[in-house]
């Protein structure tokens, strides 16, 4: 009643290993690490067989099959490459996830290397079974912005891709008779969020009252260079319009707002976000040079069709930029106090421009970002938003442009963008 001697499967073993197996003896077939028992198209960790009364084994010895992790999952804004020849997906094979550079960067700076584990899952040393996250790269235009040593007076044409965060905001307030139309600028913060000035998104229908425009009345254009040709631009409607709750229309304190886009926009050479500064009350230091871009829409009677389709009656069809130095708070405050008026340059504002004036102070559209290069992180950062002073007193002597100090609002911005009310949770990698 002895059963025949057993031969262990390739990449496997039999336990217990005996010289003789008699009736009722049982053996357990198992496979080496990275292999699984294959029996009748079923995969299992172990398989038990028994020596029967008639001297035969209850089952044939199964085979050991190498673990296969299968095709790796796709990565949003990224791609996967196989490190092993023939695109193998079996045990100990390697794959590498990478993000669509230079527009996306991997969160946590992981290697992106995943190995097929013995359990049949793609595994990373740090992230384990979780996939990496590709976040938008901010403040790194595909074209290098001009060095800031040379001073530019007045505006210069911006080459396509120099200010990929620049947004044109078009508002058509149909609740008014006649329909009201106006424009402003904004800056892309992520695939779904635009930063702008609150006054751009406030309806002037009621004085002394902050009435935000309806989201239905807002259109945002990104990747727009020449207002006469919007074919290459991405246009998006708004899902939410969020004005800072303390925005004051009398002195433009807290002049900051967000627009959440209806759908995330695809990033590319002409559409990339700007970085937010670190949350610090100081803001940019005096004499630091920053850039502001805008189409300088000077004629307010221009219609949406004219601006978007033909670009007529604007200061420039092509996006312009200007370089301006930050002015000390004390000097700016004094310059406005000397003008006799209810002007207050608060701690939530900073000023930029030249004492002798010039058209440079009015080129940036309201809501556009005043960007400064951060040497430490090697990114461009939105330190300010075009708020008041300059845009309406275009180039007057000793009338500095006043900008919203974005660093005072970083916590508020993140809070709003990550709140449950937001349609999506979004981050940006710096």
């Amino acid at each position: 009643n002895e059963c025949p001697k057993l031969q262990p499967p390739v990449y496997g073993k039999i336990e217990p290993s005996q010289a003789v197996y008699s009736f009722k003896d049982q053996v357990l077939v198992s496979c080496d690490t990275g292999y699984k028992v294959l029996k009748d198209n079923g995969v299992m960790d172990t398989f038990q067989i028994e020596c029967l009364k008639d001297g035969a084994w209850s089952n044939k010895i199964p085979t050991c099959k190498i673990v296969d992790c299968g095709a790796p999952a796709g990565l949003k804004h990224g791609l996967v490459t196989f490190s092993t020849r023939n695109n193998l997906t079996t045990y100990k094979s390697e794959i590498r996830y990478s993000c669509q550079q230079p527009y996306y960067k991997m969160l946590h700076n992981t290697t992106g290397v995943y190995t097929c584990s013995a359990h049949g899952t793609w595994t990373n040393e740090v992230l384990k079974r979780s996939l990496p996250t590709c976040l938008p790269v901010c403040g790194q235009p595909s074209r290098a912005l001009p060095n800031l040593v040379k001073r530019i007076i007045g505006g210069r044409n911006a080459e396509l891709g120099l200010f990929p965060w620049q947004a044109l905001i078009v508002v058509e307030d149909t609740s008014r008779v006649p329909n009201d139309k106006w424009f402003g600028s904004g800056a892309l913060l992520s695939e779904s969020w635009i930063l702008t000035a609150a006054h751009v998104l406030r309806s002037q229908r009621r004085d002394n009252t902050v009435i935000p425009v309806s989201k239905e009345h807002v259109t945002v254009y990104l990747g727009l260079h020449d207002v006469r040709d919007k074919s290459g631009a991405v246009n998006s409607s708004a899902a939410r319009v969020i004005l800072h709750p303390d925005f004051n229309i009398q002195n433009y304190n807290h002049d900051i707002a967000l627009v959440q886009l209806q759908k995330p926009v695809p990033l590319g050479a002409h559409v990339m976000p700007i970085c937010l500064p670190r949350p610090e009350p100081e803001g940019p230091a005096p004499h630091m040079l920053g850039l502001v871009a805008g189409w300088g829409i000077s004629n307010p009677n221009v219609t949406v069709d004219e601006i978007i389709l033909s670009g007529t009656r604007t200061l420039s069809d092509v996006l312009q930029y200007v370089k301006l130095p930050v002015v000390s708070h004390a000097e700016c405050k004094a310059s406005y106090e000397s003008r006799s008026g209810n002007y207050s340059v608060t701690e939530n504002m900073f000023c930029a421009g030249y004492y002798e004036g010039g058209k440079d102070t009015c080129l940036g559209d309201s809501g556009g970002a005043f960007v400064i290069f951060d040497e430490m992180s090697q990114h461009w950062v939105a330190q300010g938003l075009v708020s008041w002073g300059g845009p309406e007193e275009c180039g007057s002597k000793q009338v500095y442009g006043v900008y919203t100090k974005v660093s005072n609002y970083v916590d508020w911005l993140w809070e709003e963008m990550n709140s449950p009310r937001a349609v999506r949770d979004l981050q940006v990698e710096r």
């Epitope: 006649p178 106006w182 009252t209 309201s366």
Partner: antibody, heavy 116, light 112 residues
Framework: QIQLVQSGPELKKPGETVKISCKAS????????MSWVRQAPGKGLKWMGW????????TYADDFKGRFAFSLETSARTPYLQINNLKNEDTATYFC?????????WGQGTSVTVSS | DVLMTQTPLTLSVTIGQPASISCKSS???????????LNWLLQRPGQSPKRLIY???KLDSGVPDRFTGSGSGTDFTLKISRVEAEDLGVYYC?????????FGGGTKLEIK
């Protein structure tokens, strides 16, 4: 501190055109609309309409549609009222007032006399 | 258009005495936003108008507290607790709720 300074008096003939200015100072100009109000000699006040100083879009009361035009020179912080094809009944003092509806500060008024 | 009716047409008051002006609108001035855009202004002789009261009862800065505004819906009142010489002129109410905004005919306050 907040001031609206209007242009001087005008003497015009019927059929001519007049353009009145209203220079604003002491506040953020594009934050408030600007209204225009007419006061005929010895009469009360009549609201003509307003202009959105941010968008430049004018809104006219029905009685002032056609010959009347509001415009802006934002960089000079100056709204304008233009009356075309003047008639004798346009003889009045014209005021600009800050705000589309609030009208919290008023200009000193511009007297327009239309006489042949 | 909303008709604004002011009474009386003329008011003769002795200095130090109270005065009251009524303003009635042909329809309610309560706006959909919950506010009532009823305002009062004073036009002194030979001068431009000056706003005194907005949103029915809010006093403009620099306006003496002897002025009070009250009312709701279609009936509004401006009261002066003790008239002073500088108060003479024509008082107008106006509404900013229904387009186009309309003024009352004015009430001339003269000193007895």
């Amino acid at each position: 501190q907040i001031q609206l300074v209007q242009s001087g008096p005008e003497l015009k003939k019927p059929g001519e055109t007049v353009k009145i200015s209203c220079k604003a100072s002491g506040y953020i100009f594009t934050s408030y609309g600007m209204s225009w109000v007419r006061q005929a000699p010895g009469k009360g006040l009549k609201w003509m309409g307003w202009i959105n100083t941010y968008s430049g879009v004018p809104t006219y009361a029905d009685d002032f549609k056609g010959r009347f035009a509001f415009s802006l020179e934002t960089s000079a912080r100056t709204p304008y009222l233009q009356i075309n094809n003047l008639k004798n009944e346009d003889t009045a003092t014209y005021f600009c007032a800050r705000g589309g509806e609030a009208m919290d500060y008023w200009g000193q008024g511009t007297s327009v006399t239309v006489s042949s | 258009d909303v008709l604004m009716t002011q009474t009386p047409l003329t008011l003769s008051v002795t200095i130090g005495q109270p005065a009251s002006i009524s303003c009635k609108s042909s329809q309610s001035l309560l706006d959909s936003d919950g506010k009532t855009y009823l305002n009062w202004l004073l036009q002194r002789p030979g001068q431009s108008p000056k706003r005194l009261i907005y949103l029915v009862s809010k006093l403009d800065s620099g306006v003496p507290d002897r002025f009070t505004g009250s009312g709701s819906g279609t009936d509004f009142t401006l009261k002066i607790s003790r008239v002073e010489a500088e108060d003479l002129g024509v008082y107008y109410c106006w509404q900013g709720t229904h387009f186009p905004w309309t003024f009352g005919g004015g009430t001339k306050l003269e000193i007895k």
